[in-house]
């Protein structure tokens, strides 16, 4: 969110003055060019600019870095690695500029970031050891405690003959260093499934967001561990049925809130467990807004006001009973 | 091998318009940007303009920003460069590279095309 100072108390760095120090080493405190900078709020702002690197002069108070709607492409090892080091950067924002790459170690060196946001950059490279800055098996903890990467999926065009999902999911389990993550925000990624792992090593969650992806069932995921969940996006997929394993699992953590509006719920027999269970449970919010997709005759009927009457499956019928 | 093939330069009046090619092919696996130089007899090469091949980032030269336009085809390891608004100033020899790092600087480049002329004049 942005800073709570006026837009009075920035102050901007005019770009002849930085060419004419460029040649000295940075002071301390000057502010980027093509940056606003407000020390009272710890903060600098380098927005819509057009900036193909990570400014080298960033000033050392620095705790709220905006470097939105640029034209960055790739963050090297340790591109905010300074001497000394930023040691006060506690939230970073690069939504929208343009990154495609992003290699291993691009935020060592940032010992006190707590938020980082990647949104809306279509990255096509995203190293396994981005968060970790290691290639260990364990590596040291990260101190991120939000991660948010909406909408980072490149165009399927541009995704190299990999797995989207498993490049980002190589990057959040790395070295075990995201132990400590809260909130995770994975909406618009155009997801088809969850790996099995990804949730059991995220033991700290307390917020996940997967909206707007295109997730057809849960059946492989587990959310068991995540004990200290609060709330789970769910809404804007693909999914057809929650089944009686994944249903439990979700009744069994104790703070949780689910969002399921917006699937193609298909509502037939093995919709029955579900429709019992939202009847009884409290945890999914909106849950009178849940209506049948499929099949046909059961189309924006709402799933509360089924009974198992309505809930049918056609009957397979042997080979010598079908007729063309 | 990466090999790089330019095409599309030519003699254009001052104002005038041209549009470069640059055709990448051979073992492109692991290149990241191509990029445009230029070269006038006596001088360095000069950074013109760069794209991402499977990202959206460009960058332009000061020089060049607001009349020139880099795109690319992904699909066909193809980049071009729209020049509109010439000037005698930009005559030179324009040099397609491709590299693996975001970069104005030409040394970031391990790959490039043999030129082609650009004249600008009445």
């Known amino acids: 969110s942005s800073p709570t100072s006026s837009a009075s108390s920035f102050s901007s760095s005019a770009p002849f003055l930085a060419s004419a120090v460029s040649a000295q080493p940075p002071l301390p405190d000057q502010c980027p060019a093509l940056c606003e900078c407000s020390e009272a709020a710890r903060t600098v702002k380098c927005v819509n600019r057009n900036l193909t690197e990570v400014p080298t002069d960033l000033p050392a108070y620095v705790r709220n870095l905006f470097l939105t709607g640029n034209q960055l492409a790739v963050l090297p090892a340790g591109a905010f690695a300074r001497r000394p080091p930023l040691a006060e950067l506690a939230a970073l924002n690069l939504s929208g500029s343009r990154l495609d790459e992003v290699r291993a170690g691009a935020f060592e060196h940032l010992p006190s970031l707590r938020q980082l946001d990647l949104s809306h950059n279509p990255l096509a490279d995203l190293s396994p050891f981005a968060f970790s800055g290691s290639n260990a098996s364990v590596s040291a903890p990260s101190p991120l405690v939000e991660l948010i990467l909406n909408h980072i999926v490149p165009p399927e065009d541009e995704r190299q003959n990999r797995s989207f999902e498993g490049m980002v999911v190589a990057a959040l389990l790395a070295g075990r260093a995201l132990q400590g993550l809260r909130r995770l925000e994975l909406a618009s990624n155009h997801f088809l499934y969850l790996p099995r792992d990804v949730l059991a090593q995220l033991p700290s969650l307390r917020h996940l967001d997967l909206s707007n992806n295109s997730l057809v069932s849960l059946t492989y995921v587990s959310f068991r561990n995540l004990t200290h969940l609060e709330s789970l996006h769910l809404e804007d997929n693909a999914l057809k049925v929650l089944h009686n394993g994944t249903l439990a699992e979700l009744q069994g953590l104790p703070h949780i809130r689910v969002f399921l509006d917006n699937n193609p719920w298909v509502c037939d027999c093995h919709m029955a467990d579900m429709v019992t269970w939202l009847k009884e449970t409290e945890v999914v919010q909106g849950k009178d807004r849940l209506t049948c997709a499929y099949p046909e005759k059961m189309r924006n009927r709402v799933l509360l006001e089924l009974n198992s009457a309505d809930l049918d499956c056609d009957p397979i019928l042997p080979p010598s009973l079908q007729t063309s | 091998q990466v090999q790089l093939v330019e095409s599309g330069g030519g003699l254009v009046q001052p104002g005038g318009s041209l549009r470069l090619s640059c055709a990448a092919s051979?073992?492109?696996?692991?290149?990241?940007?191509l990029a445009w130089f230029r070269q006038t007899p006596g001088t360095e090469r000069e950074f013109v303009a760069a794209i991402r091949l499977w990202g959206t980032a460009t960058r332009y030269a000061d020089s060049v920003k607001g009349r020139f336009t880099i795109s690319r085809d992904s699909a066909k390891n193809t980049v071009y460069l729209q020049m509109n608004s010439l000037k005698p100033e930009d005559t030179a020899v324009y040099y397609c590279?491709?590299?693996?790092?975001?970069?104005?600087?030409?040394?970031?480049?391990?790959?490039w095309g043999q030129g082609t002329q650009v004249t600008v004049s009445s």
């Open positions: 051979g073992h492109t696996f692991d290149i990241k940007t």
């Open positions: 590279a491709a590299g693996r790092d975001w970069s104005a600087f030409s040394s970031a480049y391990d790959h």
